[in-house]
């Protein structure tokens, strides 16, 4: 999701912008940190096993807007969180995962019939 | 049009601090980052680090940090470079130049350092 | 930290001539999700500060004149000047910015025959 006052239709920033990278740092990063011209992000998603996983980094103004829409994916649990408003800016975001639906117990990626 | 202005010359001693200005005008400050970087005689040039005025974020090169602080004063739109104790080492020009993507499109005119007793 | 590596450290032409001067890179500056060229190249005349020429290896800054052509990728760049002019006197800096700390080669120093 967008951090309110985001607007939703992606523009050109003016100048580069830092954010703190996770599990999903470039080669370029240095101390954790990556550069870009859309946005900072941090997501929350199930790993196979169903263990919770975060990783932050940065998401090019390219695509980014649909990759910050949160869009649900079939049996998938994740959650994302985009923001440009300051360098570093996602450190403060804390999405979390959203509620099991009932479907989920059933044909979820760690349960098997 | 795009300027940065910076004094033209500093003396001071060995031992003591200096603080650098850059003054920038003819476009919004907060919208680029300032950077500093230091040019011995006859040498290359060195990057000492950058700042974002807009939330006053900072990079440093490791080999400076213990050297330089970097800030800034959104109302006058002018960044400044405090550097401590002072050797000869310092001594220098050191030039702030802008930048939106990480190369420097304007540069002030730079200040002479020279650190002496 | 990247090291950059410029050569020739001087050179002397008469005007009208071509000249080329390399730079060369410790590692890659060429971004695999846009493959852009991380390099700018600037010319500092004599008692002037530094002036950029051309940023992303080859895209010439505006107002630089067009016998200013920048070329390479990867880890070898090279400045060419069509046709030299007296007023090209000056010293050549390359500048990585693929990763911090930014760093600068050596210079090549052009003198006018």
């Known amino acids: 999701k967008k951090e309110d006052g985001e607007s939703t239709a992606p523009t050109a920033r003016p100048k580069v912008l830092r954010c703190k990278c996770h599990h999903h740092c470039p080669e370029d990063s240095v101390n954790n940190i990556c550069s870009t011209d859309g946005y900072c992000f941090t997501m929350i998603e199930e790993d196979d096993s169903g263990t919770p996983v975060v990783t932050s980094g940065c998401l090019g103004l390219e695509g980014s807007d649909f990759q910050c829409r949160d869009t649900p994916i079939p049996h998938q649990r994740r959650s994302i969180e985009c923001c440009t408003e300051r360098n570093e800016c996602n450190k403060d975001l804390h999405p979390t995962l959203p509620p099991l639906k009932d479907r989920d117990f059933v044909d979820g990626p760690i349960h098997h019939k | 049009q795009v300027q940065l202005q910076q004094p033209g010359a500093e003396l001071v001693m060995p031992g003591a601090s200096v603080k650098l200005s850059c003054k920038a005008s003819g476009y919004t400050f907060t919208n680029y980052w300032m950077h500093w970087v230091k040019q011995r005689p006859g040498q290359g040039l060195e990057w000492i680090g950058e700042i974002d005025p807009s939330d006053v974020y900072t990079t440093y090169n490791q080999k400076f940090k213990d050297k330089a602080t970097l800030t800034v004063d959104k109302s006058s739109s002018t960044a400044y470079m405090q550097l401590i104790n002072l050797t000869s080492e310092d001594s220098a020009v050191y030039y702030c130049?802008?930048?939106?993507?990480?190369?420097?499109?304007?540069w002030g005119q730079g200040t002479a350092l020279t650190v002496s007793s | 930290d990247i090291v950059m590596t410029q050569s020739p450290s001087s050179l002397a032409m008469s005007v009208g001539q071509k000249v080329t001067m390399s730079c060369k890179s410790s590692?890659?500056?060429?971004?695999?999700?846009?493959?852009?060229?991380?390099l700018a190249w600037y010319q500092q005349k004599p008692g002037q500060s530094p002036k950029l020429l051309v940023y992303?290896?080859?895209t010439r800054e505006s107002g630089v004149p067009d016998r200013f052509i920048g070329s390479g990728s990867g880890t070898d760049f090279t400045l060419t000047i069509s046709s030299v002019q007296a007023e090209d006197l000056a010293d050549y800096f390359c500048?990585?910015?693929?990763?911090?700390?930014?760093?600068f080669g050596g210079g090549t120093k052009l003198e006018i025959k």
């Open positions: 992303f290896a080859s």
């Open positions: 500048q990585q910015y693929y990763s911090t700390p930014w760093t």
């Open positions: 130049a802008r930048s939106g993507w990480d190369y420097f499109d304007y």
């Open positions: 590692q890659s500056l060429l971004k695999s999700n846009n493959q852009k060229n991380y």
